[in-house]
């Protein structure tokens, strides 16, 4: 008798999910020698344990604590780059500026980046057919709770000047409902963080507007100021030139505004 399976609105678990997580863990420890104390089998077991046999709408941060413990990592707290809706450029930036880190440059972020996963209540099976959608099904699903947990911890660890890259091409440059707006902003520690510096990335070639004056940026400034953290904002008019200048800061064309 075929067992009834819950149909969720979101895509199912990424194919080769266990193999991918394990392979990513091993790769990470190979290229980050300081993390070679990590036992990747234990990491996978803890990851699996967070969602397997559990209802995929009933996941808690507590479920991920064993994984968080195994993935504990110290990154320089004054070298943190947050991002919202502009992941690729943020990653291109930290690829060049090697001393700065996005969440996906840490072990736990690297393991889960771009993956989807969920299980089923009372069975040890991974659901490759469908997983809950945050909007249409439930917010306490395995993927959303994971990113909420790691994002909160990442923001809590930040100190001094924290940078955030924001997408100037979107209608809401700062979106209160994004992970940055709903989790990270509220978990920066005012006793450690002096300034949040926003970099607003322009999309259009001829876009010379000051997007730091955008109403949503003003809203971000207000939230941050109320938390006793200073706020500053810069327009990045030419993201391509910006990256080039990070690579070659001595280039003569890099003295002008980018």
């Amino acid at each position: 008798v075929p067992r009834w399976r819950q149909q969720w609105s979101g895509p199912g678990t990424t194919k080769r999910f266990p193999e991918t997580v394990l392979a990513r863990c091993v790769k990470y420890t190979e290229i980050h020698p300081e993390m070679r104390h990590v036992d990747c089998q234990s990491v996978w077991d803890a990851f699996k344990g967070a969602f397997i046999s559990k209802h995929p709408c009933n996941i808690t941060e507590e479920d991920y604590q064993p994984l968080m413990k195994l993935g504990t990592q110290t990154v320089p707290c004054n070298k943190i780059l947050l991002w919202s809706r502009i992941k690729d450029l943020a990653h291109q930036f930290t690829q060049v500026q090697r001393d700065m880190f996005t969440l996906e440059d840490t072990l736990l972020g690297y393991l889960a980046d771009d993956l989807t996963w969920c299980g089923e209540f009372n069975t040890s099976k991974i659901n490759y057919q469908s997983c809950p959608d945050w909007r249409k099904d439930c917010s306490n699903n395995p993927v959303s709770v994971f990113w909420k947990t790691v994002s909160r911890r990442f923001a809590e660890a930040a100190c001094d000047v924290v940078h955030v890259m924001l997408n100037g091409s979107r209608s809401k440059i700062f979106d209160k409902n994004s992970t940055f707006g709903s989790v990270e902003v509220h978990n920066l520690q005012p006793e450690k963080v002096q300034t949040l510096e926003a970099w607003v990335i322009h999309g259009g070639r001829e876009d010379s507007r000051d997007l730091c004056q955008d109403p949503t940026i003003k809203e971000l400034e207000s939230i941050i100021s109320k938390r006793n953290i200073q706020f500053s904002c810069k327009n990045i008019y030419r993201p391509d030139k910006f990256l080039q200048c990070v690579k070659n800061p001595e280039d003569s064309s890099c003295t002008s505004e980018i």
Epitope: E19, E30, I31, P33, R36, C40, Q41
Partner: antibody
Framework: QMQLVQSGAEVKKTGSSVKVSCKAS????????MHWVRQAPGQALEWMGW????????DYAQKFQDRVTITRDRSMSTAYMELSSLRSEDTAMYYC????????????????WGQGTLVTVSS | DIVMTQTPLSSPVTLGQPASISCQSS???????????LNWLQQRPGQPPRLLIY???TRAAGVPDRFSGSGAGTDFTLKISRVEAEDVGVYYC?????????FGQGTKLEIK
């Protein structure tokens, strides 16, 4: 079985560039970091850099930082190493290499090597 | 960068006799995970290198048990209990404790 097959020998002029390919088979290409190592005639081995084929992220030895670019084509399971501004000292055998995984741990040793690509730089 | 120094640079040996190659690193290769990130590679004439030993003393797959690695911290030894004709080539030690991975200058094993 696991294989790394490299492109053929190249003769290049001083100041030009060379692009060497390394085609992987017998395993999931994106699951392993790919390294590049070179060996000048009668000299020791010299590590040049790595690429994570899944993300395309790279890291290079300081010595080659300004001249080397490692890329990959996931659909072809192939990694590439391009070296620019060639000089006579770049005449060497260029190898791609990969570690083995021992019960979910990277061994830290290059267990699999391509056959090598001889690049000769002449003026 | 960690500097790897091998001695001797050339080692003439008699078939069937033991051979020993030494390698010294400029800093300890012992990781906090308890593993020592020292490898030995063999390169036969006209061939790519072949991994013999990793983690200082673990033989790679398919490597005969006449090859053994030992050492501690910064001093390492590769021993061949009885040299065979196919062992002729250059032997390299290599550290993988940190980036960049670095190699010794090689020791040429030749038959007397």
């Amino acid at each position: 079985q696991m294989q790394l097959v490299q492109s053929g020998a190249e003769v290049k002029k001083t100041g030009s560039s060379v692009k060497v390919s390394c085609k992987a088979s017998g395993y999931t290409f994106t699951d392993y970091i790919m390294h590049w190592v070179r060996q000048a005639p009668g000299q020791a081995l010299e590590w040049m850099g790595w690429i994570d084929p899944e993300y395309g992220s790279t890291d290079y030895a300081q010595k080659f930082q300004d001249r080397v670019t490692i890329t990959r084509d996931r659909s072809m399971s192939t990694a590439y190493m391009e070296l620019s501004s060639l000089r006579s000292e770049d005449t060497a055998m260029y190898y791609c290499a990969r570690v083995a995984i021992i019960t979910t741990v990277a061994s830290g040793g290059f267990a699999y090597w391509g056959q090598g690509t001889l690049v000769t730089v002449s003026s | 960068d960690i500097v790897m120094t091998q001695t001797p640079l050339s080692s003439p040996v008699t078939l069937g006799q033991p051979a020993s190659i030494s390698c010294q690193s400029s800093e300890s290769l012992l990781h906090s995970n308890g593993k020592t990130y020292l490898n030995w590679l063999q390169q036969r004439p006209g061939q790519p290198p072949r991994l013999l030993i990793y983690w200082m003393s673990t033989r790679a797959a398919g490597v005969p048990d006449r090859f053994s690695g030992s050492g501690a911290g910064t001093d390492f030894t590769l021993k061949i209990s009885r040299v065979e004709a196919e062992d002729v080539g250059v032997y390299y030690c290599q550290q993988f404790l940190e980036y960049p991975p670095t190699f010794g200058q090689g020791t040429k094993l030749e038959i007397k």
